[in-house]
């Protein structure tokens, strides 16, 4: 049953002369193992014999002998599974069928191998990407129908027969399926490579030559473009011609359409190799390249940058920044179109000439207010002089300067007079919008940067105003210098230092805490009686009598001030002592007799002795000596003696005359 | 074929004034830079003043800055070259130049020059 | 503008007449004899008048433009003035380069 045997290799099989074949071959025989085996050359059925003629150039029988002329060939299989062959050397005359004559037990088998030898090396075979475009990374394949273990080969890559740098990958196939030696080569062809040609080659072990395949490259590519330019270093004046070409060196395909840029920007109606721009202007200065385009895509020159050169355009100022405060540092920047770039500047300030400024930027490092005005400048270049432009203006802006404040009443100013002040300013800017005064006070402006005090306080000593607008200035304080009466006028004792005794010698002062004018007269006064003009005064020897109320008087030319009344007290012992007798001297007995100690003391008396005509104290101590009923005994001369915290004081005797009642004589 | 014929040359009084005058056929005149460049006994070439094809710049060598003046008539394809309170310097042959542009490019893109007309200042 | 005094060569052979000074163009003038008329050979760096044999060639690199004479001939023994402009366009030329072919 033929189906049993299954065969795999691959169908033909290709070497040259010398060189060797490898058969890669499986099998499978189901109903046992292999137990012979005989590989014919051209084999052929007899049907007489029932068996196959041909050269046999292989023969294994049961005992596994094999003639030593079949060395050449060797069967590399076994049994039940590998029927691999191998031919060494392989001659142009193995060409043909090789069969493979297999027998088991019970069946038989013819497999039909085709081997194709030729008489020298046959070429590899390139393989090209259907389409090959400039920069994108294609594979070229070698690939040739040949391996075998014992003929090592080589495949060599070549560019113009010079080999390629790139680093190929060779693989080799020895299997059932195919048996191939290939070579693979990655490779970024650019649009020079365009109808260059390709060799791979074929080398033994030793690199010697056996066969090559080339092919030519079709490299598609972009128009690849020179751009040329009169004058060629383009640069040109305004008004001058210039012409620009452009020229095809490779396109692959054909192009199609051609086109100019001017910095990037597509150019109307420029759709020719030439471009030509007569009486060229400043604003044509720019980038300009050509493009043209194919199937693949556009291609660009290189770029060329025309320079259109002219003489300085009227020049206008930047300034950073204005307004500027004073102070600050402001740069001025003189802008002005120009090709070459300007070599030297002239400035301007308020139109006059800045000495020494010839560069693009002008630096202040601090700005007063007399750098405000027009600043302008003029550029030059080495095609000529600009014109100046319209300038700009700086401002300077500072706080009001030289402020004062100002009085416009008429001088002396006194206590209780209306003031006006006025804030006056030399300069300012921006202009003045409000004052402040100091210090500050219930005021009144009636306009602005005036001052209106009502009534004037003799304190008000000084006044100072500051102008403002974004800042505040203030004026040095101006002095009111208010004139007024001598304030604070009072009496002061100097001396003693504690309390006025009789006979003390006693100084007061007159004192006052202030006076506008300084020049002052002073008054004493007692009781409405002139006393003296000096500030001071003096008792050598104060008496009781001296007591009372002062007061003293301060005048300048404002006006006179008056203290406040001040009591002079004077201490002394009891004095003018009496004993005054109530209802009299004479008094009948049996009545009530009152006997009264007067006295004149400061401070009063504090204890009172009473004495009889015997000098004896009584033993009474009131100021009252009751006495009740009175007896005839009582006659006689009495005294008292007062006491206070000064001393002590008597006073002389006095009789009372007690006499019998009328009952009394009656009874006698 | 382009020729450049000047005239105007001989003999001149010092402080005096010359002028020169280039005839220009075989090219269209009103496209190109035209001028003069000039050469002493014995020395070498020496620019002296060029003019763009418009007319809108002239250029002048510092030996003659201020004394010179040039001029193009474009109707008549001529060129003129002035030149005031002569010197002995100014001695010398005379050559009329075309620029290769229309722009003047001073002494770098001259293309064609005439024969010369030769000028001698002396009293 | 400096370029040497004088150059030779044997007919046949390369020369090279270098020019340095300016950073704009240059052009390149042939005079036979003194007061007789230049004959320009480059102008424009390396741009060559139909007329003149394309032995002439100009090249420039930086503000140095060389004249090269390939397969120099008797016919060019003259003097050889470079030629360019200032930055103000007027023009300057060299002293001029004497050629003496051998």
């Known amino acids: 049953d033929s189906s049993k045997w299954v065969f795999e290799h691959p169908e033909t099989l290709y070497a040259w002369e010398g060189a060797c074949v490898w058969i890669p071959c499986t099998y499978r025989a189901l109903d046992g193992d292999l137990e012979s085996f005989i590989l014919f050359h051209n084999p052929e059925y007899n049907k007489n014999t029932s068996k196959f003629d041909g050269t046999r150039l292989y023969e294994s029988t049961k005992d596994g002998k094999v003639p030593s002329e079949q060395k050449r060939v060797q069967f590399l299989g076994d049994k039940n599974k590998n029927c691999t062959l191998s031919i060494h050397p392989v001659h142009l005359n193995d060409s043909g069928q090789l069969g493979l004559r297999m027998e088991s037990k019970t069946e038989k088998w013819m497999e039909r191998i085709h081997l194709n030898v030729s008489e020298r090396p046959f070429p590899p075979h390139i393989q090209l990407p259907p389409e090959i475009q400039e920069s994108q990374e294609v594979t070229l394949t070698c690939l040739l129908n040949f391996s075998c273990y014992g003929y090592p080969i080589q495949l060599q890559w070549l560019l113009e027969g010079v080999p390629m740098r790139q680093a190929a990958v060779t693989s080799t196939s020895l299997t059932i399926k195919s048996v191939f030696t290939r070579s693979e080569l990655k490779f970024s062809p650019q649009w020079s490579h365009h109808g260059k040609i390709v060799t791979c080659q074929l080398q033994d072990a030793d690199g010697k030559f056996l066969s090559n395949d080339t092919v030519q490259l079709n490299v598609k590519h972009t128009p690849k473009l020179e751009i040329k330019v009169t004058p060629s270093d383009a640069i040109v004046r305004e008004g001058d011609s210039v012409t620009m070409t452009c020229e095809v060196s490779s396109s692959n395909p054909e192009y199609t359409t051609v086109s100019w840029l001017k910095d990037g920007t597509s150019l109307k109606k420029q759709n020719t190799f030439t471009l030509n721009l007569r009486e060229v202007t400043k604003d044509q200065s720019g980038k300009y390249c050509c493009q043209v385009s194919n199937d693949v895509g556009p291609g660009r020159s290189e770029e060329v940058f025309l320079q259109v050169q002219y003489a300085p355009e009227p020049s206008t100022v930047q300034i950073l920044h204005s307004p500027a405060v004073e102070g600050s540092q402001v740069e001025f920047l003189c802008m002005s179109l120009a090709n070459p770039l300007p070599t030297n500047y002239t400035w301007y300030h308020n139109g006059k000439e800045m000495q020494g400024r010839t560069e693009e930027k002008v630096h202040i490092p601090k700005i007063l207010p007399w750098h405000a005005g027009t600043y302008s400048c003029v550029a030059e270049n080495i095609l000529g002089t600009g014109q100046r432009g319209p300038g700009a203006e700086l401002d300077v802006q500072y706080p009001p300067k030289k402020v004062t404040t100002v009085i416009q009443n008429p001088m002396p100013i006194r206590e209780g007079d209306t003031v006006t002040l006025s804030c006056n300013y030399n300069s300012s800017n921006p202009s003045v919008t409000r004052y402040e005064w100091k210090p500050h006070g219930a005021w009144e402006e009636p306009s602005l940067g005036v001052l209106k005090i009502q009534n004037v306080g003799w304190d008000n000593t000084t006044i100072a105003c500051a102008a403002c607008n974004s800042w505040c200035s203030w004026a040095s304080p101006v002095a009111l210098n208010v004139q007024y009466a001598p304030r604070d006028v009072r009496v002061r004792k100097i001396k003693p230092l504690s309390e006025i005794h009789s006979g003390n010698s006693v100084s007061l002062q007159c004192d006052f805490s202030s006076s506008h004018p300084k020049e002052v007269q002073f008054f004493w006064e007692k009781n409405g009686r002139l006393l003296g003009k000096e500030s001071q005064l003096n008792f050598d020897s104060i008496s009781p009598e001296d007591a009372g109320s002062y007061s003293c008087w301060v005048n300048n030319s404002i006006g006179q001030t008056a203290s406040k009344a001040w009591t002079l007290e004077v201490l002394y012992a009891p004095r003018r002592l009496r004993v005054s007798m109530s209802p009299g001297d004479q008094v009948m007995e049996g009545k009530s007799a009152t006997l009264t100690c007067e006295s004149d003391a400061n401070p009063p008396v504090s204890h009172y002795t009473w004495f009889d005509w015997n000098n004896q104290s009584l033993p009474y101590h009131s100021q009252k000596l009751r006495l009740e009923p009175v007896k005839v005994q009582h006659s006689g001369a009495y005294w008292c003696q007062g006491t206070n915290s000064v001393g002590k004081g008597r006073s002389p005797l006095s009789t009372l005359t007690v006499y019998y009642s009328p009952e009394t004589i009656g009874r006698r | 074929a382009v020729t450049l014929d000047e005239s105007g040359g001989g003999l001149q009084t010092p402080g005096g004034g010359l002028s020169l005058v280039c005839k220009a056929s075989?090219?269209?005149?009103?496209?190109?830079?035209m001028g003069w460049v000039r050469q002493a006994p014995g020395k070498g070439l020496e620019f002296v003043a060029f003019l763009g094809s418009s007319s809108s710049y002239t250029d002048y060598g510092a030996a003659v800055k201020g004394r010179a003046t040039i001029s193009r008539d474009n109707g008549q394809s001529t060129l003129r070259l002035q030149l005031n309170n002569l010197r002995a310097e100014d001695t010398g042959t005379y050559f009329c130049?075309?620029?290769?542009?229309?722009?003047?490019?001073?002494?770098?893109?001259?293309?064609?020059w005439g024969h010369g007309t030769e000028v001698i200042v002396s009293s | 503008l400096t370029q040497p005094s004088s150059v030779s060569a044997n007919p046949g052979e390369t020369v090279k007449i270098t020019c340095s000074g300016s950073?704009?163009?240059y052009g390149w003038y042939q005079q036979k004899a003194p007061g007789s008329a230049p004959v320009t050979v480059i102008y424009d760096n390396t741009n060559r008048p139909s007329d003149i044999p394309s032995r002439f060639s100009g090249s420039k690199s930086g503000s140095t433009n060389t004249l090269t004479i390939t397969g120099v001939q008797a016919e060019d023994e003259a003097v050889y003035f470079c030629g360019s402009r200032d930055s103000t366009y007027v023009g300057i030329f060299g002293a001029g380069t004497t050629l003496t072919v051998l």
């Open positions: 075989g090219f269209s005149f009103s496209d190109y830079g």
């Open positions: 950073n704009n163009t």
């Open positions: 130049a075309k620029s290769a542009y229309g722009g003047s490019y001073g002494s770098s893109s001259i293309d064609a």
